[in-house]
């Protein structure tokens, strides 16, 4: 009788075991026999693992209605964080190997980094395992000796081999017992791993005429594995081809004397064991998938699948999957994996160039003809920095535009004693009729009375200061500094721009009669005005500083 549940397929065998053990204890038991806790790297492998668990569950007499968990070889080491961007979420297979695309998580994973975490298969032990419903993966603490973790019932091991032998063919009554390298005995393997021993006991079993034969699964030629036996075993003239088709793989031909021979269908040939048939062209059945090319093995035996460049064989060795070249960080900055290839990209602010494949170099956004800035532009690594000349502030959603500062409505209060005119990047002062602009370009002095428009400055006009001028501009935040050579009493921050080519006009004459000091006058009802801080208010009127923009409109911008 079989001592454990075992399933062999492809180039691996899976065993399932009961035992309330920690993940580390389970891994040690697998390791002792040359294996690891099982991988589940594809749906095909998930089916093999499900089959071995179904075998195990069938042997258990009375299973209660409960959820049970079986360790597999997926773990995340202490200090490695959950990574939601990967199919395995930062977990890796204990035997090593690549990050595989297949996963079957039961639910949202717990977000952690500190603790080691282990994965088990979640089974409803009261239900039969249906082929379409593969066991879900459950993540949790890895347990410790004597404290395996909640609902842990057992574990699944995987043993990998260089190849498999077909089961021995019996042409008459008998019993074959296979002993595998991982110390499991079984009579019902669909594939038998390399280095397994087979004990064949021929006969009905209750008679003394039973004979025993021993065979070893050997590698006869590269990738060719067989038992070294010739012809069906336990043959008896009594049965001929009637027992198990004579043990033949395909056709059985009887001779008249009770002897028989195995044969093959067209397109197949009989192998050296005189039992098994193999395709004359092993690739004729198109075993390779996903763009893989089939390469026949030597002597028309076996085959290998080969993938195009940029792809690699998956765990089944039959299908091609894309190689993620980006794992090797071939690019200086950004790597985009594409089917069969990859491409390098540069971050915003960089462009392809420089030494080496996939290199990136800084884009000089400030270079001639490409500056995004309205005024000043400073290139930085991977970016740029816009700045504005004095009298302007950065504006626009992206901070590349420059907007004129309306000094006449600035936070520092009135800049001019009387009239203030905003200009692009600066401002200038003016006076009411009967007053003239003082040499400081800010104050108004009593002049000859006239009913003309407000007066501009005297001939020697002052311009508002700019960067690089002989008079440094004052900081906007401290409204104490007047034009050089004047007492610091005028509430201005920068010297005004005084320009004769922009005459001061459009102030209604009927409201321009001087009244008291030059900074005090009745508010024209049609003007938007800005209140002057600290000014005295004449009887019957509001005190204000009129503002007028260069475009001829009145008031605040």
């Amino acid at each position: 009788a079989d001592t454990e549940a075992v399933v062999c397929a492809g180039t691996a065998c899976y065993t399932a075991h009961w035992g309330k053990l920690s993940a580390a204890e389970a891994q040690n038991l697998c390791l002792q026999n040359g294996g690891n806790l099982a991988t589940v790297k594809s749906e095909e492998e998930a089916q093999h693992v499900q089959q071995v668990l179904a075998q195990l569950l069938r042997r258990e007499a009375a299973l209660t209605a409960r959820m049970g968990k079986f360790w597999i070889g997926l773990q995340r080491e202490k200090g490695k964080c959950l990574d939601p961007s990967l199919p395995l979420k930062g977990f890796s297979w204990v035997g090593g190997g690549e990050d595989t695309p297949y996963s079957n998580w039961h639910k949202e994973l717990r977000n952690s980094c500190i603790s080691k975490r282990c994965v088990s298969l979640l089974l409803d032990l009261s239900q039969p395992l249906l082929p379409g419903r593969l066991p879900k993966w459950s993540e949790g603490p890895c347990g410790s000796p004597g404290s395996p973790g909640s609902n842990i019932e057992g574990f699944v091991c995987k043993f990998s081999f260089k190849g498999m032998c077909r089961p021995l063919a019996l042409g008459g009554p008998g019993q074959v017992t296979y002993t595998t390298p991982f110390q499991t005995t079984s009579s019902s393997l669909e594939a038998v791993p390399f280095a397994s021993a087979a004990n064949v006991a021929c006969g009905e079993g209750d008679k003394d005429d039973s004979q025993s034969h021993y065979f070893l699964c050997k590698e006869k030629a590269p990738d060719v594995f067989d038992w070294g036996s010739s012809g069906p075993l336990c043959v008896s003239p009594k049965y001929g081809c009637n027992f198990n088709n004579g043990g033949c793989h395909q056709d059985c031909f009887e001779g008249g004397d009770g002897s028989f021979l195995c044969g093959c269908r067209p397109g197949f040939r009989l192998l050296d064991d005189l039992v098994t048939c193999a395709s004359r062209n092993p690739c004729s059945s198109s075993p390779c998938r996903g763009g893989a090319t089939c390469i026949p093995g030597p002597h028309g035996k076996n085959y290998t699948c080969r993938c195009p460049q940029g792809y690699q064989l998956d765990s089944s060795q039959l299908d091609c999957v894309d190689v993620d070249e980006c794992q090797d960080s071939p690019c200086a900055q950004e790597c985009v994996n594409t089917p069969g290839s990859f491409r390098c990209e540069c971050w915003v602010g960089y462009e392809p160039g420089g030494p080496g494949e996939g290199a990136c170099q800084d884009v000089d956004e400030c270079a001639l003809g490409r500056s995004p800035c309205a005024q000043g532009c400073t290139n930085t690594e991977g970016s740029f920095h816009c700045s504005c000349e004095e009298g302007y502030v950065l504006a626009g959603e992206d901070g590349t535009q420059c907007q004129d500062v309306d000094e006449c409505v600035g936070p520092g209060g009135p800049l001019c004693d009387s009239l203030c005119f905003n200009t692009q990047g600066s401002f200038r002062c003016g006076c009411l009729p009967g007053w003239v602009l003082a040499p400081n370009g800010v104050s108004c002095a009593m002049g000859p009375v006239s009913l003309g428009p407000p007066s501009g400055p005297p001939d020697e006009e002052y311009k508002g200061e700019r960067e690089g001028s002989t008079v440094p501009p004052a900081a906007t935040a401290s409204p104490t500094r007047g034009p050089e050579g004047t007492p610091k009493s005028t509430p201005t921050t920068r010297r005004p721009l005084l320009s004769s080519d922009a005459p001061i006009t459009s102030v209604p004459l009927e409201v321009l009669a001087p009244s008291g000091s030059p900074g005090l006058w009745r508010e024209p009802s049609i003007h938007h005005t800005t209140a002057a801080s600290g000014a005295q208010e004449p009887a019957g009127g509001d005190s204000s500083v009129a503002t007028q923009n260069d475009d001829g409109t009145d008031g605040q911008k």
Partner: antibody, heavy 120, light 108 residues
């Protein structure tokens, strides 16, 4: 919403120990790790270590040479950080913090901080 | 341990300016594990950007980040008065987690 409320300011003598608490609310306490970060006056941030309340596993910054112990009490949803053999260099504000539903150790939630002064 | 060096250590900029802070690591850091925090005086740090370029919940879009390997950048596209604070980068690529030395941002 997630809240981390820390114990009050402490004044300790050199050589003494301090135990700072951090009470969590607004989530299942065992779902998120708890970490501790300190900041000396006028200095930057220094990670001290963290604890996984589900398992009790810890990770410590070796700079603290075995002087630090982090524990949790799941019944009260409280994390503790004990620092022993205090010197004046341990004068700092101590923060508990965790990364909630964010990944990769991006610390999304912080306690208000506990000021610890070590002075003779 | 990985050392994070921030530059500049302090900077003064005007409202509306574009501000850039650089964080260099002594060895390569996965972009998923590089984050940026803002800390105002007397307050706990606040997460602004996680995994190099993702905005934390409720953080204004004027904040952004980029980078990979050993060089990461944090940008404020248009500086606001309320952005006055110290900014820290933080990485994890095995214990210990480390923070950058900090960049103190002031308004001109």
């Amino acid at each position: 919403q997630v809240q981390l409320v820390q114990s009050g300011a402490e004044v300790k003598k050199p050589g003494a120990s301090v135990k700072v608490s951090c009470k969590a609310s607004g989530y299942t306490f065992t779902d998120y790790e708890m970490h501790w970060v300190r900041q000396a006056p006028g200095q930057g941030l220094e990670w001290m270590g963290g604890i996984d309340p589900e398992t009790g596993d810890t990770a410590y910054n070796q700079n603290f040479k075995g002087r630090v112990t982090m524990t949790t009490d799941t019944s009260t949803s409280t994390a503790y950080m004990e620092l022993r053999s205090l010197t004046s260099d341990d004068t700092a504000v101590y923060y508990c913090t965790n990364y909630g539903n964010l990944y990769y150790y991006a610390m999304d939630y912080w306690g208000q901080g506990t000021s610890v002064t070590v002075s003779s | 341990e990985i050392v994070l060096t921030q530059s500049p250590s302090s900077l003064s900029a005007s409202v509306g300016d574009r501000v850039t802070i650089t964080c260099r690591a002594s060895s390569s850091v996965s972009s998923s594990y590089l984050h940026w925090y803002q800390q105002k005086p007397g307050k706990a740090p606040k997460l602004l950007i996680y995994s190099t370029s993702n905005l934390a919940f409720g953080v204004p879009s004027r904040f952004s980040g980029s980078g990979s390997g050993t060089s990461y950048t944090f940008t404020i596209s248009s500086l606001q008065p309320e952005d006055i604070a110290t900014y820290y980068c933080q990485q994890y690529s095995g214990y210990p987690l480390t923070f950058g030395s900090g960049t103190k941002l002031e308004i001109k």
